[in-house]
């Protein structure tokens, strides 16, 4: 893959801009500078100046003021003012507001429920495989393997609490040491951030909305990945998390506490348990190498059971295997002993849709995965639509000001920390960081919350989920209390360490810059969002997993060159932007590389070819399909409901649209049009919410 998505001639001057680059770029443009931009070394070089901070539009004329795509959109209120309404209008307006609020809460409820069912679906599809990841003995010696197992398992079961509880039970039963568990917890932290990234994909319809939503979601990913990148080697070298948490656990004489309060689950469980109920113990049993569990179904059939303890006679290889010498005898052929067995008597079946279908877990999981994604997408569209109609004019201004404005000087720096606390508190209330960050994603998309404000909220969410884990640990039975508490504290201190690394100093807020960079790339090449998801959450972890299984030598043999190349590219990139003069002429830009290695354009062409079949029949039978359609084929006209793409060739012929001055754009999402992907007249036919 390219070192940077779009690398034209690297500028000798570090203050100039690169289109689509995810590198460090000043936020305020220097209009006196110019930059060369080419996609091909042979192509004539056009002197252009790029828009401020990541804009993908190329402009020839001296620009008048152009909006930064990261600026929040102004939500115009086209309705009649309150004061101008008559009594009947006011009453109607009031009830409309109440109706909207009820609808909003309703869709929000089903949105959260669909997230829960999505998690169940993932567990049904990949839960057993996830459990088997844990039974790999190399975890003990290889922290990198532990990390990727944490990522993969959490991605597969869509729940960090499930993977964490498996780790806790494995530590409690001495199958895993706390030292070996820490990388898995770090991986679980990464894995849990996939949920809101999936939610962000649902907002693919509107480019500007998608840019913000995807960046807002991936800021969580980047925070977690960067934290691990720094803290995993530190932990391996110093074991500071293990030591600190051990000291805390040993210094307190904990008594078993109460269970963490299930505040949101109380509301959602009555509905979700009618859809499906899972026996989560099965995944844990598989992780603990229980052979019988491999054939068990995750779908819970019996909800009311009676457990009867009884003693049975069992044969043993020798008297040494007897439960005790007093419970040991021979029948002349075999040695026998008495074992306590728990006999489970099924009394009442569970009340959910799949209870009598007896379908395999994969089938149930697939059905639920599709349905939950459809509901998730539908609810998200409706939430965005309702919020869009509510948050207009004055209301939007007030909300945006309240959420995004800092405290007055000299307390401005405190705002972010308050946001961290709010994020932690909200996550504690909803008992899930996935739910909180997923609910945040559409708000970032529609422009209610800035990424700069979403970032501390997300960090707070990371803390909130660990406090829930600490409470849950305190409620553990005696034998599991110490291990579960230590693991929960490791999780807590890992997130605290991450915040200390990537938040207090504005300069270190790298996740924001990286997320914005990715947001820009994904807004231009929407397929890249899916590509990013697959690469970071599946391919990289699976590759590391595979290499780890092959042994340390193979892992180091492949890993060291890869890491070396990445570091080399980063150093070169840094030198190109900061002090290019120290580099030889050839290395001052990326033109020495073939186009496919420095630009996403050729890859875009390949993806377009593959999705050509979708482009030609890009029908939108439903508004939900529209999202998938836009994501797959980047079709400009596909989202007029029940209409298909008309004359795509026309859109493709218009590839070389002349570059315009900013005043000719009638949409702030100018990047696509500026790149000549769609005629100007169609700039508003992007996938609208409804």
């Amino acid at each position: 893959m390219a070192p940077w998505p779009e690398l034209g001639d690297a500028q000798p001057n570090p203050d100039k801009y690169l289109e689509g680059a995810a590198g460090q770029q000043p936020t305020a443009p220097d209009k006196s500078k110019e930059t060369n931009k080419t996609d091909n070394t042979e192509a004539p070089v056009t002197k252009i100046e790029l828009l401020p901070s990541y804009s993908t539009a190329t402009l020839i004329d001296e620009p008048t003021e152009v909006d930064d795509p990261w600026n929040l959109p102004t939500l115009q209120d086209s309705g009649i003012k309150w004061s101008e309404r008559d009594t009947k209008g006011k009453i109607l307006c009031f009830f409309q507001g109440i109706g909207r609020l009820i609808l909003l809460l309703g869709f929000l409820y089903f949105f959260v429920c669909s997230l829960d069912i999505l998690s169940s679906a993932f567990q049904l599809v990949g839960g057993k495989m996830a459990g088997q990841f844990f039974s790999n003995s190399s975890i003990m010696s290889n922290p990198l393997l532990g990390l990727v197992i944490g990522v993969l398992v959490t991605v597969l079961v869509q729940s960090s609490s499930t993977s964490t509880s498996i780790v806790v039970s494995m530590v409690s039963s001495s199958l895993l040491t706390v030292r070996a568990a820490i990388p898995i917890i770090m991986g679980a932290n990464i894995g849990t951030s996939i949920t809101n990234t999936i939610v962000a994909l649902m907002q693919v319809g509107d480019r500007s909305e998608f840019r913000r939503a995807f960046a807002g979601a991936t800021v969580h990913d980047f925070f977690n990945w960067l934290s691990v990148l720094v803290l995993l080697p530190v932990e391996v070298a110093t074991h500071y998390l293990e030591i600190i948490t051990q000291l805390i656990v040993e210094s307190f004489h904990f008594k078993n506490g109460e269970d963490a309060p299930d505040l949101l689950k109380v509301i959602t469980k009555p509905f979700t348990k009618l859809i499906v109920q899972l026996d989560k113990k099965v995944i844990s049993q598989i992780a603990m190498n229980d052979e019988k569990a491999k054939n068990k179904s995750l779908v819970k059939i019996w909800c009311k059971t009676f457990t009867n303890k009884t003693q049975i006679n069992v044969t043993v290889p020798s008297t040494a295997n007897c439960t005790s010498p007093s419970l040991c005898w021979t029948d002349g052929i075999q040695n026998w002993t008495m074992k306590n067995v728990t006999y489970k008597e099924n009394i009442a079946k569970c009340q959910h849709i799949f209870v009598n279908f007896h379908l395999p877990d994969l089938a149930v999981g697939t059905i639920l995965l599709i349905l939950s994604l459809l509901v998730l997408c539908g609810c998200l569209i409706m939430i965005v639509k309702i919020l869009g109609s509510v948050l207009k004019g004055q209301v939007a201004t007030v909300i945006k000001k309240t959420i995004n404005t800092d405290f007055p000087f000299p307390f401005a720096w405190l705002t972010g920390y308050l946001a961290i606390l709010v994020g932690a508190g909200m996550t504690f209330i909803v008992q899930s960081s996935s739910v909180f960050t997923s609910a945040l994603t559409p708000l970032i998309g529609i422009g209610v919350i800035t990424i700069e404000r979403a970032y501390p909220l997300t960090l707070g969410s990371n803390i909130g989920t660990t406090t829930t884990a600490i409470l849950a640990a305190l409620a553990s039975p005696g034998n599991a209390l110490r291990s579960s508490l230590q693991i929960a504290l490791c999780h807590f201190f890992f997130n605290i360490s991450g915040i200390l690394l990537w938040y207090p100093i504005p300069f270190t807020r790298l996740p924001i810059r990286m997320a914005k960079g990715l947001g820009n790339i994904s807004a231009k090449y929407r397929w890249f969002a899916v590509f990013y998801l697959i690469i970071f959450f599946f391919l990289i972890p699976l590759t590391v997993f595979g290499l780890s299984l092959a042994g340390w030598r193979v892992l180091v043999g492949v890993g060291v060159p890869v890491v070396f190349i990445i570091i080399l590219v980063l150093c070169l990139r840094l030198l190109q932007s900061r002090c290019p003069r120290v580099l030889p002429k050839k290395l001052q830009n990326w033109n020495f590389l073939p186009l496919w290695m420095r630009s996403l354009k050729p890859w875009d062409a390949v993806v377009s070819k593959f999705t050509g079949c979708f482009q030609m029949r890009c029908c939108c039978c439903c508004r939900v399909c529209c999202r998938a359609c836009c994501l797959l084929c980047d079709c400009p006209k596909c989202c007029r409901c029940s209409k298909c793409c008309e004359d795509l060739e026309e859109a493709q012929e218009g590839q070389d649209v002349p570059v315009k001055a900013p005043e000719t754009f009638d949409n702030i999402t100018i990047s696509r049009e500026a790149q000549g992907e769609v005629p100007a007249s169609d700039s508003k036919t992007e996938c609208t919410a409804l």
Partner: antibody, heavy 119, light 107 residues
């Protein structure tokens, strides 16, 4: 009713082999173990070996390992014991008995087969 | 192997007497002990299993007790038909071992 009918008395020379039978009736042959116990004249009982007709599992007392061979014929519900390399001290009454799997007792015994070893 | 020692090796008692036969194991057999009765010219019969449990069809005058290494068979009221040789057998440790027997006679 449960019956274990053993073959008749045998007189053997030292070094020879003897094969005795035990025909079972009145119960499911494969559900029980068949034990062989001997009693030398004026002596106590001595356990020799056992076999499970159901799965063919065998077990021998160390003393008889290699000399005693237990077999079963499920079609006729008959158990056999062959004792080789006979010595004069092998002169005894050989009993077959029925024992329930998992139980350390024999509840029904055969009438015994007298084996006399003399030159 | 576990050695089983019965005492006395023979005893005489009158009809109606309470008779006690003891059996000592060379090591703890954890109550895994049976008692058998062998009448002259008849098949051996199981009387008591697992120290104290009466086999079906056995008169209630027979009882067993004991633990560890010491066990007893008691006939509460001796009857003429009880004339026989009595054997104890342990089944805690492989192989099964029997006591040398106690011969009971009527005075």
């Amino acid at each position: 009713q449960v019956q274990l009918v053993q073959s008749g008395a045998e007189v053997k020379k030292p070094g020879a082999s003897v094969k005795m039978s035990c025909k079972a009736s009145g119960f499911t042959f494969t559900s029980y173990n068949v034990h062989w116990v001997r009693q030398a004249p004026g002596q106590g009982l001595e356990w020799i070996a056992a076999i499970s007709p159901g799965n063919g599992d065998l077990s021998y007392a160390q003393k008889f390992q290699g000399r005693a061979t237990l077999t079963v014929d499920r079609s006729t519900s008959t158990a056999y014991m062959e004792l080789s390399s006979l010595r004069s001290e092998d002169t005894a009454v050989y009993y077959c008995a029925r024992g329930r799997t998992g139980m350390g007792a024999v509840d029904y015994w055969g009438q015994g087969t007298l084996v006399t070893v003399s030159s | 192997d576990v050695q089983m020692t019965q005492s006395p090796s023979s005893l005489s008692a009158s009809v109606g007497d309470r008779v006690t036969i003891t059996c000592r194991a060379s090591q703890d057999v954890y109550s895994y002990l049976n008692w058998y009765q062998q009448k002259p010219g008849k098949a051996v019969k199981l009387l008591i299993y697992y120290t104290s449990r009466l086999q079906s069809g056995v008169p209630s005058r027979f009882s067993g007790s004991g633990s560890g290494t010491d066990y007893t068979l008691t006939i509460s009221s001796l009857q003429p038909e009880d004339i026989a040789t009595y054997y104890c057998q342990q089944y805690n440790i492989f192989p099964w071992t029997f006591g040398q027997g106690t011969k009971l006679e009527i005075k």
